[in-house]
């Protein structure tokens, strides 16, 4: 059940968006941690990757993720939810050929092996938040963000734009 065939095929794309060009505008290798400085780690178990949210021991090496940035254009006359203009989207890859995917049906964040072009489930609108934090909004499900739940990554529905600053959907990116 691991691989592209397991990815749910959702048709509701974020704001009917189109990603400009197929190649990323830039890439960035960073470690990912929560607002409370817990590290996001990736472990290979039974031929599939698991994602953990944990406190690392001092001097323990942090896992890195390759963020690929894409420009996304959202014409206001096409968007049904009042969002228009230019946005930055990212894909996140902790290791070659594997990408974080939003499984909206299970409200989970999973690592899937797949080939390019990547499915919509691998794309997230990147939000530049306060306190040097970012948030990741699902392209396939507006208002749903990657968040932390029970020491795992999960998809969390933000019921109001005014709740965008809740700590469990805020992440820090660091080169170290």
């Amino acid at each position: 059940a691991f691989g592209i065939s397991g990815v749910q095929k959702y048709t509701r794309a974020l704001h009917d968006s189109s990603i400009t060009g197929i190649s990323p505008i830039t890439e960035y290798l960073a470690s990912l941690s929560t607002y409370n400085d817990q590290s996001i780690t990736f472990a290979l178990e039974d031929e599939s990757y698991e994602i953990y949210v944990e406190d690392l021991k001092k001097d323990e090496k942090k896992d890195k993720v390759l963020l690929s940035y894409y420009e996304s254009q959202h014409p206001s006359n096409e968007s049904g939810d009042g969002v228009d203009g230019k946005m930055l989207m990212v894909t996140l890859s902790p290791t070659k050929d594997f990408w974080l995917h939003a499984n909206n049906k299970e409200h989970s964040v999973e690592l899937h092996k797949c080939e390019k072009p990547l499915p919509d489930q691998a794309f997230f609108v990147l939000h530049n938040m306060h306190s040097n934090c970012v948030s990741f909004e699902c392209k396939t499900d507006p208002g749903v963000f990657i968040g932390v739940k029970d020491n795992h990554l999960a998809l969390i529905k933000v019921d109001s734009s005014e709740n965008l600053c809740t700590e469990n959907i805020l992440f820090k990116l660091s080169e170290t």
């Epitope: 009042g82 228009d84 946005m87 609108v125 990147l126 530049n128 109001s160 709740n163």
Partner: antibody, heavy 121, light 111 residues
Framework: EVQLVESGGGLVQPGGSLRLSCAAS????????MNWVRQAPGKGLEWVAE??????????DYAESVKGRFTISRDNAKNSVYLQMNSLRAEDTAVYYC????????????WGQGTLVTVSS | DIQMTQSPSSLSASVGDRVTITCRAS??????????MNWFQQKPGKAPKLLIY???NQGSGVPSRFSGSGSGTDFTLTISSLQPEDFATYYC?????????FGQGTKVEIK
């Protein structure tokens, strides 16, 4: 059509107060951070204030030159952002622009046409 | 605060010329692998219009003759072939953190 329309500008005496309004239309207002930027006659652009989104309180930031005198606020139900300006000085004379950041808060994307504030006795 | 220094403050050019404007930040405006550097065009009596965001990406409806480059502290706006409607004042701005500061502007005039 995405639009920002400023109002409330005018002539005011030094030490006086003025409240600028910015009416937004064509987009879901409560999804965007809003800013005010001003431009003195014949001069460059100066950022004034920003209001973000938060469930507890709106995060607000101000330029040092207006801190303690100006207050930014928003009313999502009315799709509006405001700038309350107190203790006005001659150097506050400028065109004041209301600005919407892009979705995701990376840059200033949409600007209003501006409203002129003149502080003079 | 991050200071933005733009040069030149003004320049004279002809239609068809290649025009380059530079902007230097007092410290890096990069974060998360993105340069928080933007360029705006302003015509007399009008509001500024976004040309370039994140150093090198075009705003909506911006002609392809406008391009941006750079990272860290040094940035460039290039107009590959100046058109009559391009005579205006251009501003750089960083949006990395408050206060968001602008360059002093570059006025592009007809030679």
């Amino acid at each position: 059509e995405v639009q920002l329309v400023e109002s409330g500008g005018g002539l005011v005496q030094p030490g006086g107060s003025l409240r600028l309004s910015c009416a937004a239309s064509g987009f879901t207002f409560n999804k965007f951070w809003m800013n005010w930027v001003r431009q003195a006659p014949g001069k460059g652009l100066e950022w004034v204030a920003e209001i973000r989104l938060s469930s507890i309180n709106y995060v607000k930031d101000y330029a040092e030159s207006v801190k303690g005198r100006f207050t930014i606020s928003r009313d999502n139900a009315k799709n509006s952002v405001y700038l309350q300006m107190n203790s006005l000085r001659a150097e506050d004379t400028a065109v004041y622009y209301c600005i919407r950041r892009n979705y995701g808060n990376w840059f200033f994307e949409i600007w209003g046409q501006g409203t002129l504030v003149t502080v003079s006795s | 605060d991050i200071q933005m220094t733009q040069s030149p403050s003004s320049l004279s050019a002809s239609v068809g010329d290649r025009v380059t404007i530079t902007c230097r930040a007092s410290e890096s405006v990069d974060r998360y692998g993105i340069s928080f550097m933007n360029w705006f065009q302003q015509k007399p009596g009008k509001a500024p219009k976004l040309l370039i965001y994140a150093a090198s990406n075009q705003g909506s409806g911006v002609p392809s003759r406008f391009s941006g480059s750079g990272s860290g502290t040094d940035f460039t706006l290039t107009i590959s072939s100046l058109q009559p409607e391009d005579f205006a004042t251009y501003y750089c701005q960083h949006s990395k953190e408050v206060p968001y500061t602008f360059g002093q502007g570059t006025k592009v005039e007809i030679k």
